[in-house]
């Protein structure tokens, strides 16, 4: 019964699966990009190290009305242990340059692919 219960109500998604799905979504965004992504909106670039997922969400959550990245925003929130609101930046987030969302997505995708290859799923 316990096992069946597990099947009936899916448990947490394994980190490797969640990361793969995020990578797939970012690939989808970059490949399907026709017009400039999010009208060329600019967001704060991030340091792709500690706290990367929360920092990425802190940057992207400020962009509203861009359906192309809404799924990415939701997926990133699953990687970030705390709630992130628009206009909120942690001490880890150094605001030194803004880049277009399209470039942000490309940079994030390259880094996540590297993490996946190295088996770093968290």
């Amino acid at each position: 019964l316990t096992c069946l219960g597990g099947f009936a109500s899916p448990g947490p998604v394994p980190p490797s699966t969640a990361l793969r799905e995020l990578i797939e979504e970012l690939v989808n965004i970059t490949q399907n990009q026709k017009a400039p992504l999010c009208n060329g909106s600019m967001v704060w670039s991030i340091n792709l190290t500690a706290g990367m997922y929360c920092a990425a969400l802190e940057s992207l959550i400020n962009v509203s009305g861009c359906s192309a990245i809404e799924k990415t925003q939701r997926m990133l929130s699953g990687f970030c242990p705390h709630k992130v609101s628009a206009g909120q930046f942690s001490s880890l987030h150094v605001r030194d340059t803004k880049i277009e969302v399209a470039q942000f997505v490309k940079d994030l995708l390259l880094h996540l692919k590297k993490l996946f290859r190295e088996g770093q799923f968290n």
């Epitope: 400039p36 999010c38 009208n39 060329g40 909106s41 600019m42 967001v43 400020n62 962009v63 509203s64 009305g65 206009g87």
Partner: nanobody, 116 residues
């Protein structure tokens, strides 16, 4: 409808100064972060500077740090960019932008040409 109207550009010699202005309407200006973005001939868009809603938080691209100053007057719904020690590489069309909305609401921009 959001409207942004830039002005103040022109031809200036290297080492000279200009002050750009941007008149904003159609939204509650004092509630939003604002950006200056530029586009040099034949190049992509480049972020220049940002300012927080209250005006106390300011940020600059390394290429303009120490030379440009961003400011705002929320009572006049106006954004400014004071540009000093201008260089040939600062030649571009300058746009003001409501942060995170992209060029959907950009104005026509104002051309800054730095040349002797």
């Amino acid at each position: 409808e959001v409207q942004l109207l830039e002005s103040g550009g022109g031809l200036v010699q290297p080492g000279g100064s200009l002050r750009l202005s941007c008149a904003a309407s159609g939204f509650t200006f004092r509630d939003y972060e604002m950006d200056w973005v530029r586009q040099a001939p034949g190049k992509g868009r480049e972020w220049v500077s940002s300012i927080g809603p209250g005006g106390s938080e300011t940020y600059y691209a390394d290429s303009v740090k120490g030379r440009f100053t961003i400011s705002r007057d929320n009572s006049k719904n106006t954004l400014y960019l004071q540009m000093n020690s201008l260089r040939a590489e600062d030649t571009a069309v300058y746009y003001c932008a409501k942060a995170y909305t992209g060029f959907k609401y950009w104005g026509q921009g104002t051309l800054v040409t730095v040349s002797s």
